[in-house]
């Protein structure tokens, strides 16, 4: 079977600072030198791109400067961090991996990670 499989955790709870991290791991059917990783958010059957990065195997993963994502790569594993999350961002975050080069191209889509975000309670006023 030449399909590419992608694994990611089913559930992640964001920190009180609105940061969520999870690992996206893929079983590569080929020897890719160029890989693209995309995080998609699925809510109410609408799919939107959260962030994307292309990297050369052995090099670091670099998202655009204004991206809410950061990440590191190690072999066939990508550690993804999404920042600035609020309660309204709770949803299913899907890891999509594409082996861009050399041919043939392969696509891998994970089942998604449900990220729960709870907005922190405002701090009560203090006399101190």
């Amino acid at each position: 079977c030449k399909a590419m499989h992608v694994a990611q955790p089913a559930v992640v709870l964001a920190s009180s600072r609105g940061i969520a991290s999870f690992v996206c791991e893929y079983a590569s059917p080929g020897k890719a030198t160029e890989v693209r990783v995309t995080v998609l958010r699925q809510a109410d059957s609408q799919v939107t791109e959260v962030c994307a990065a292309t990297y050369m195997m052995g090099n670091e993963l670099t998202f655009l400067d204004d991206s809410i994502c950061t990440g590191t790569s190690s072999g066939n594993q990508v550690n993804l961090t999404i920042q600035g999350l609020r309660a309204m961002d709770t949803g299913l975050y899907i890891c999509k991996v594409e082996l861009m080069y050399p041919p043939p191209y392969y696509l891998g889509i994970g089942n998604g990670t449900q990220i729960y975000v709870i907005d922190p309670e405002p701090c009560p006023d203090s006399d101190f």
Partner: antibody
Framework: QVQLVESGGGVVQPGRSLRLSCTAS????????MDWVRQAPGKGLEWVAV????????YYADSVKGRFTISGDSSKNTLYLQMNSLRAEDTAVYYC???????????WGQGTLVTVSS | EIVLTQSPGTLSLSPGERATLSCRAS???????LAWYQQKPGQAPRLLIY???SRATGIPDRFSGSGSGTDFTLTISRLEPEDFAVYYC?????????FGPGTKVDIK
Amino acid sequence: QVQLVESGGGVVQPGRSLRLSCTASGFTFSSYGMDWVRQAPGKGLEWVAVIWYDGRNKYYADSVKGRFTISGDSSKNTLYLQMNSLRAEDTAVYYCARGGLLGGFDYWGQGTLVTVSS
Amino acid sequence: EIVLTQSPGTLSLSPGERATLSCRASQSVSSSYLAWYQQKPGQAPRLLIYGASSRATGIPDRFSGSGSGTDFTLTISRLEPEDFAVYYCQQYGSSPFTFGPGTKVDIK
């Protein structure tokens, strides 16, 4: 809303060249793979070529490799297919299509007819 | 290259009947990477199903997809007059992307 509009089709002699264009609107061009698919008269669908994201990666069907070149201009939101050394068997309606974020071709143009005949 | 075969070539049915279309792959296709399209004469194809079983935006729930490995099925639970068309399956998990030859659903 998303729209794809092809142009550039017509009648051309074998061995000659033609360039097809596909103007996209309603989405960010560089976030999607863009494909060309063709359909010979009375036949099924045949995938022709794809270009991804920043335009560096392009793949082709064996039947057109070395003769056709796919390219894109994200500033104009336009996809192109340069077709050289055309053959009678390239006669078809050519569609441009957007690769959906989760796969499949989710939007298609109306198609442009290319007829290769002497 | 993954070769897709579709059966039957033509399916003659009446409105209100159930249509079952088959798509078989020459090698295993992960279910995440199989799509179904509908095409009517003189029109562009329309995406019905992606990921073998997920309906595309705006597709009525009488269309459903299933299957895994090498065998996939598109089911139309009750045929409406506008459903008589040609249906294609496609794999997009690896290049070259390939389509099946199509199944024509026509009115009996």
